[in-house]
Amino acid sequence: QVQVVTQDEREQLYTPASLKCSLQNAQEALIVTWQKKKAVSPENMVTFSENHGVVIQPAYKDKINITQLGLQNSTITFWNITLEDEGCYMCLFNTFGFGKISGTACLTVYVQPIVSLHYKFSEDHLNITCSATARPAPMVFWKVPRSGIENSTVTLSHPNGTTSVTSILHIKDPKNQVGKEVICQVLHLGTVTDFKQTVNKG
């Protein structure tokens, strides 16, 4: 049967993002409608037809436009994505002969990790703290010269949709660590980034 080809997209917060739908059909549609999927019922965003051109709903006036004006291939672009834009979007091709044929493309918003790495001596031990804030939640690992060093991790979700993961490395004999390199590894969206810290006796 006739189908619609879509592709999910993952884009960085406060950057543009585009979602595309392609009708796999010999003929163009009569009208294309883009809707945001909502819990109760989908919300109309924009339509494109030969009769009326592009019609953007008021709530989306300054947020989106149709950047590929086609009745077989249609692309909407968000000028500056926010966390509220994350979700799934339906493109509906109203075709002659086959009715409304829909596809779904999902948009995921990410925030690159902001990482801080510092250490603190206190009496007979050393705490090295690595904190990473990102969306989706990052993971924090340690690479240390020797094994058996304990660490504790705390995860905190923020109202802005980001998550902070803070890991503290507890070193009981700090003298052995002076001059040596400790690496905090942050894993985010399949990419591992190393953050290096050399411990100096303050």
């Epitope: 049967q1 006739v2 796999q24 059909n25 010999a26 003929q27 163009e28 549609a29 009569l30 009769n51 075709t95 002659f96 002969g97 086959f98 009715g99």
Partner: antibody, heavy 117, light 107 residues
Framework: QVQLVQSGAEVKKPGASVKVSCKAS????????ILWVRQAPGQRLEWMGH????????NYNLKFKGRVTITRDTSASTAYMELNSLRSEDTAVYYC??????????WGQGTLVTVSS | DIQMTQSPSSLSASVGDRVTITCKAS??????LSWFQQKPGKAPKSLIY???RLVDGVPSRFSGSGSGTDFTLTISSLQPEDFATYYC?????????FGQGTKLEIK
């Protein structure tokens, strides 16, 4: 020039099947939907269904309860409409037509199917 | 199914007359309506699509209007070759359905 040429008149007995062909020429067969419409004597036109020759996707009027099948042979640029379990009320002229979206421009000459015992 | 009701069912008019045929849908069909002309023993001929768009080669004396549920076909000045039966077709919702036809006869 564009032509849709339908097969000749048929006389069938109740319960039999009929297969009407519609041969297209003068254009790219897969670029246009082929639709089938019938008209019983003195009656209004009736949409039976249609096919997108590009993918072979078809859509039918449920009134025919699965009795109608529309197919195509792209190598022969021909569409077919088969109607099974014929009854007297299926006596009609059957037309094929082509459309680009909702733009109908060429029709076949019509095929009279008579169902009689 | 969406019901399409044409009026009048038949109409007598003279060459040069302005004629209007209406088609009413049982529910909103947007602008998804076509008009056809059919002469006895012949295949239908497309006149108008999407309520108001003229098919290539159709004389400009034919025009269509309307949206939603009420549609009109107008022939501005009847010519001898216009005497025929006219049908409307809705294609907003499947199954697509025709009106019962309006027979235009010579007065």
């Amino acid at each position: 020039q564009v032509q849709l040429v339908q097969s000749g008149a048929e006389v069938k007995k109740p319960g039999a099947s009929v297969k009407v062909s519609c041969k297209a020429s003068g254009y790219s067969f897969t670029d246009y939907i082929i639709l089938w419409v019938r008209q019983a004597p003195g009656q209004r036109l009736e949409w039976m269904g249609h096919i997108d020759p590009y993918y072979g996707s078809s859509n039918y009027n449920l009134k025919f309860k699965g009795r109608v099948t529309i197919t195509r042979d792209t190598s022969a640029s021909t569409a077919y409409m088969e109607l099974n379990s014929l009854r007297s009320e299926d006596t009609a002229v059957y037309y094929c037509a082509r459309s680009k979206r909702d733009y109908f421009d060429y029709w076949g000459q019509g095929t009279l199917v008579t169902v009689s015992s | 199914d969406i019901q399409m009701t044409q009026s009048p069912s038949s109409l007598s008019a003279s060459v040069g007359d302005r004629v209007t045929i209406t088609c009413k849908a049982s529910q909103d069909i947007n602008s998804y309506l076509s008009w056809f002309q059919q002469k006895p023993g012949k295949a239908p001929k497309s006149l108008i699509y999407r309520a108001n768009r003229l098919v290539d080669g159709v004389p400009s004396r034919f025009s269509g209007s309307g949206s939603g549920t009420d549609f009109t076909l107008t022939i501005s000045s009847l010519q001898p070759e216009d005497f025929a039966t006219y049908y409307c077709l809705q294609y907003d919702e499947f199954p697509y359905t025709f009106g019962q036809g309006t027979k235009l006869e010579i007065k």
